[in-house]
């Protein structure tokens, strides 16, 4: 079901031609259109020294339509605006300006950042990551047998990439050393990655130290658990030969 609109009644102008060009409701040989059919906009077009009335189905770029009972007019948008619904509601700014809530701004307000692709002020988006996935099986050179110490890895996904001013993403990869019960590889098992391998858990009270890899060091935002006191590190090396080490990758 759609709303319907009746035709607007128009008074005829005296000494006016009836054989008007498309869109004109009334016109004269000298001035062109004097009024337009419904839903058309009246505009003046300069031809040499003379201004001719024309009827347009929509206003040209940089202009917006205003309705009055007897005429629909095209009016210029503000100087800094390319397209608009009216002077107070711009929909696309001129080059060098950013659109925010219908206004064209030189700089974006506090808490927003400029998107130079859309030329809009947009909310700052911070990185969002998923929960960690479970640790992978303990392996060494792709094998789950024939060794005592190996490494295990866990990953998490980036759910929301940050915008230019947003917080960087925390590490999405973490690797640590692990130990398994020594087991000789069976024939044909060499190189296979076992899935059901039991891992020895770190001793109670033992923390996992995180050592960022080279990629991680590129990040300017240090993650608290990555800081390690050097004395504690030395002490721990002596105390515990079965320590587990985390290696994180920052994206």
């Amino acid at each position: 079901q759609n709303a319907s609109r009746g035709r607007r009644q128009r008074r005829m102008h005296p000494n006016v031609s009836q054989g008007c060009q498309g869109g004109c409701a009334t016109c004269s040989d000298y001035n062109g259109c004097l009024s337009c059919k419904p839903r058309l906009f009246f505009a003046l077009e300069r031809i040499g020294m003379k201004q001719i009335g024309v009827c347009l189905s929509s206003c040209p770029s940089g202009y917006y339509g205003t309705r009055y009972p007897d005429i629909n007019k095209c009016t210029k948008c503000k100087a800094d605006c390319d397209t608009c619904f009216n002077k107070n509601f711009c929909t696309k700014c001129k080059s060098g300006f950013y659109l925010h809530l219908g206004k064209c701004l030189d700089n974006c307000p506090e808490g927003l950042e400029a998107n130079n692709h859309t030329m809009e002020c947009v909310s700052i988006v911070h990185c969002e990551v998923s929960e960690w996935n479970p640790w992978s099986p303990c392996t060494k050179k792709g094998k789950t047998c024939g060794f005592k110490r190996g490494t295990e890895t866990r990953v998490r996904e980036i759910i929301q990439h940050p915008s230019a001013k947003g917080n960087l993403c925390p590490p999405t990869n973490e690797t640590r050393k692990c130990t398994v019960q020594r087991k000789k590889c069976q024939k044909g098992e060499r190189g296979k990655k076992g899935r059901e391998r039991k891992r020895k858990k770190p001793n109670k009270g033992e923390s996992k130290e995180a050592i960022p890899d080279s990629k991680s060091l590129e990040s300017s935002k240090e993650i608290p658990e990555q800081r390690e006191n050097k004395q504690q590190q030395k002490k721990r090396k002596v105390q515990d030969k079965q320590k587990s080490v985390s290696v994180s990758t920052v994206h």
Epitope: N2, A3, G65, R67, F85
Partner: antibody, heavy 117, light 111 residues
Framework: QVQLVQSGAEVKKPGASVKVSCKAS????????IHWVRQAPGQGLEWIGY????????GYNQKFKNRVTMTRDTSTSTAYMELSRLRSEDTAVYYC??????????WGQGTTLTVSS | DIVLTQSPASLAVSLGQRATISCKAS??????????MNWYQQKPGQPPKLLIY???NLESGIPARFSGSGSGTDFTLNIHPVEEEDAATYYC?????????FGAGTKLELK
């Protein structure tokens, strides 16, 4: 005469997305912007945003900015409104309307969206 | 955002009497001498229908018993004389600023 015909009712689960269509006829599709307005059961009207069919430029109410996408297909004179990450509060009738010189003068019949688990 | 406050929320009017609905804007909706205020009528199960544009201009095909007035922040829709088919919900809407906003509506019932 001008007509805006919308797609049928939709039932969606929370977290899903919905894409509603609005087919225009009786006028030159690229002449006027198309806007989307919604109405929750027993509630008032809420403006979602607009699209210019001539170039595809769109603008959205800040409230919906990260969840709504408006597109158009000029070959079929159809405008689309996609709303993602649906929640129960999105249950409403969604209308498309032509915007003529700062007012909504033609409206579609409405598309009922129900979001329920 | 410009908030539009309609009053009353509902009113009951006898046939042939006058119905007056008010719409107050939280800030002016005027610009360059134009008032960007529109009025719509909505009946159950139907989309809204434009009645008045630019505060006081009657949309074509709408009966002359509907009239709009006001400027700046205070606007009024009058229906006189009220007819049976006028039972509906009426909304004011501003087009002056982003985002476009509507009033909460006024339900008109017949006594």
């Amino acid at each position: 005469q001008v007509q805006l015909v919308q797609s049928g009712a939709e039932v969606k689960k929370p977290g899903a997305s919905v894409k509603v269509s609005c087919k225009a006829s009786g006028y030159t599709f690229t002449d006027y912007s198309i806007h989307w307005v919604r109405q929750a059961p027993g509630q008032g009207l809420e403006w979602i945003g607009y699209i210019y069919p001539s170039n595809g430029d769109s603008g959205y109410n800040q409230k919906f900015k990260n969840r709504v996408t408006m597109t158009r297909d000029t070959s079929t004179s159809t405008a689309y409104m996609e709303l993602s990450r649906l929640r129960s509060e999105d249950t409403a009738v969604y209308y498309c309307a032509t915007y003529f010189a700062n007012n909504f003068d033609y409206w579609g019949q409405g598309t009922t969206l129900t979001v329920s688990s | 955002d410009i908030v539009l406050t309609q009053s009353p929320a509902s009113l009951a009017v006898s046939l042939g009497q006058r119905a007056t609905i008010s719409c107050k804007a939280s800030q002016s909706v005027d610009y360059d001498g134009d008032s960007y205020m529109n009025w719509y009528q909505q009946k159950p199960g139907q989309p809204p229908k434009l009645l008045i544009y630019a505060a006081s201009n009657l949309e074509s095909g709408i009966p002359a018993r509907f009239s709009g007035s006001g400027s700046g922040t205070d606007f009024t829709l009058n229906i006189h004389p009220v007819e049976e088919e006028d039972a509906a919900t009426y909304y004011c809407q501003q087009s002056n600023e982003d985002p476009l906003t509507f009033g909460a509506g006024t339900k008109l019932e017949l006594k």
